[in-house]
Amino acid sequence: QSNCTCPTNKMTVCDTNGPGGVCQCRAMGSQVLVDCSTLTSKCLLLKARMSARKSGRSLVMPSEHAILDNDGLYDPECDDKGRFKARQCNQTSVCWCVNSVGVRRTDKGDQSLRCDEVVRTHHILIELRHRPTDRAFNHSDLDSELRRLFQERYKLHPSFLSAVHYEEPTIQIELRQNASQKGLRDVDIADAAYYFERDIKGESLFMGRRGLDVQVRGEPLHVERTLIYYLDEKPPQFSMKRLTAG
């Protein structure tokens, strides 16, 4: 390799100081070693994003409208595998429980709040509104293009993209993945959805010059608005029930 970088994660610091001079990359903000042949976990990416904000780095910063969930960005606690810890707290000792995509699923409390487990988000619904086109996209062509995108770019196994719905101008992409279905090397739907969200916003986490290039029969797909809904294996525990939109 002509230099030591992480093709799948811009938010890393890489060096060849490891055994045998092998290129090793650590996530900014956490110093956790990342596997650059696959997607980095959303928790480590959020942590890196917050550390970049604090240090004033201009790399891959969110647009002013970037909203991950109803609470906005926060500096998460990740476990040693880079996954979200069940309980998250801010600097003022306000705590809450999160699901596996890091979205709050309980009311906020104090440090006595208990979160027994990270509840898995097993169903992610990505809703896109595309820019007006001369004519509607062919549903079948759109379906195969989006399936190809998730398989090729994010390495998500095709079985985890359960459906693509289309009613012009709204596209819905359904990702489903139970804990029992996810193999050791399988990309998590949470990570695929987050990379896709950043790609759509023009904030790609990949190193290369190539941005997202989604086109159906030669017609580019330009996304105007994105909404992401997360459904957990257990219902959220809000005093007033609501579906979490990202």
Partner: antibody
Framework: AVTLDESGGGLQTPGGGLSLVCKAS????????MFWVRQAPGKGLAWVGV????????NYAPAVKGRATISRDNGQSTVRLQLNNLRAEDTGTYYC???????????????????WGHGTEVIVSS | ALALTQPSSVSANPGETVEITCSGG???YGWFQQKSPGSAPVTVI????YRLSDIPSRFSGSASGSTATLTITGVRVEDEAVYFC??????????FGAGTTLTVL
């Protein structure tokens, strides 16, 4: 079956320019990246460049950067390599190749080539 | 790197298993067979481990980190050829190895 037919090779003069054309058939041309690869006599394969599906992105090897232009016509299912300021070291067989992974973060990789043309021979000599 | 690193030659008896390694790439690896100089290469493996439908099942590919391996299980005389690996460098410029000559004894 996928077929890639290159044309436009032959004897070229140093300092001049050449235009190679590759005609594709047997697949949905509009859905795939296209590559050019060359091989000097008695040498190995050398990646020349790539163009994405829409033609909005190209990438070139350092040896040809600034001298090469890859373009495509999706209506005609053709891809063209224009190479200017020719040198003796540009001599070789030029292959057109089909990419297989247009969305991949490493889509420019030679590891994404799944089909090759028969090649067209270029000789740069005075 | 200006080229990927692969052995210049390997040899084996018919029926044996042959492994050819390739290192120094960043991204997907492919393997290409060229039976004679000037003849068109044939893709044997693309995207690390995908085999084209008309390629015999004795050919397989794997990749780990920045190293890829082409394995021919039960090599045959007709497999004699030069095998090139392909990938990219970390600046996304495509790369090939110098080629490995496989001799079946």
């Amino acid at each position: 079956a996928v077929t890639l037919d290159e044309s436009g090779g032959g004897l070229q003069t140093p300092g001049g320019g050449l235009s190679l054309v590759c005609k594709a058939s047997g697949f949905d041309f509009i859905d795939y990246d296209m590559f050019w690869v060359r091989q000097a006599p008695g040498k190995g394969l050398a990646w020349v460049g790539v163009i994405n599906r829409s033609g909005s992105y190209t990438n070139y090897a350092p040896a040809v950067k600034g001298r090469a232009t890859i373009s495509r016509d999706n209506g005609q299912s053709t891809v063209r390599l224009q190479l200017n300021n020719l040198r003796a070291e540009d001599t070789g067989t030029y292959y057109c190749a089909k990419g297989v992974c247009t969305h991949c973060w490493d889509a420019d990789s030679a590891g994404n080539i799944d089909a090759w043309g028969h090649g067209t021979e270029v000789i740069v000599s005075s | 790197a200006l080229a990927l690193t692969q052995p210049s030659s390997v040899s084996a008896n018919p029926g044996e298993t042959v492994e050819i390694t390739c290192s120094g790439g960043s991204g997907n690896y492919g393997w290409f067979q060229q039976k004679s100089p000037g003849s068109a290469p044939v893709t044997v493996i693309y995207n690390n481990n995908y085999r084209l439908s008309d390629i015999p099942s004795r050919f397989s590919g794997s990749a780990s980190g920045s190293t890829a391996t082409l394995t021919i299980t039960g090599v045959r005389v007709e497999d004699e050829a030069v095998y090139f690996c392909g990938s990219a460098d970390s600046t996304y410029v495509g790369l090939f190895g110098a080629g490995t000559t496989l001799t079946v004894l």
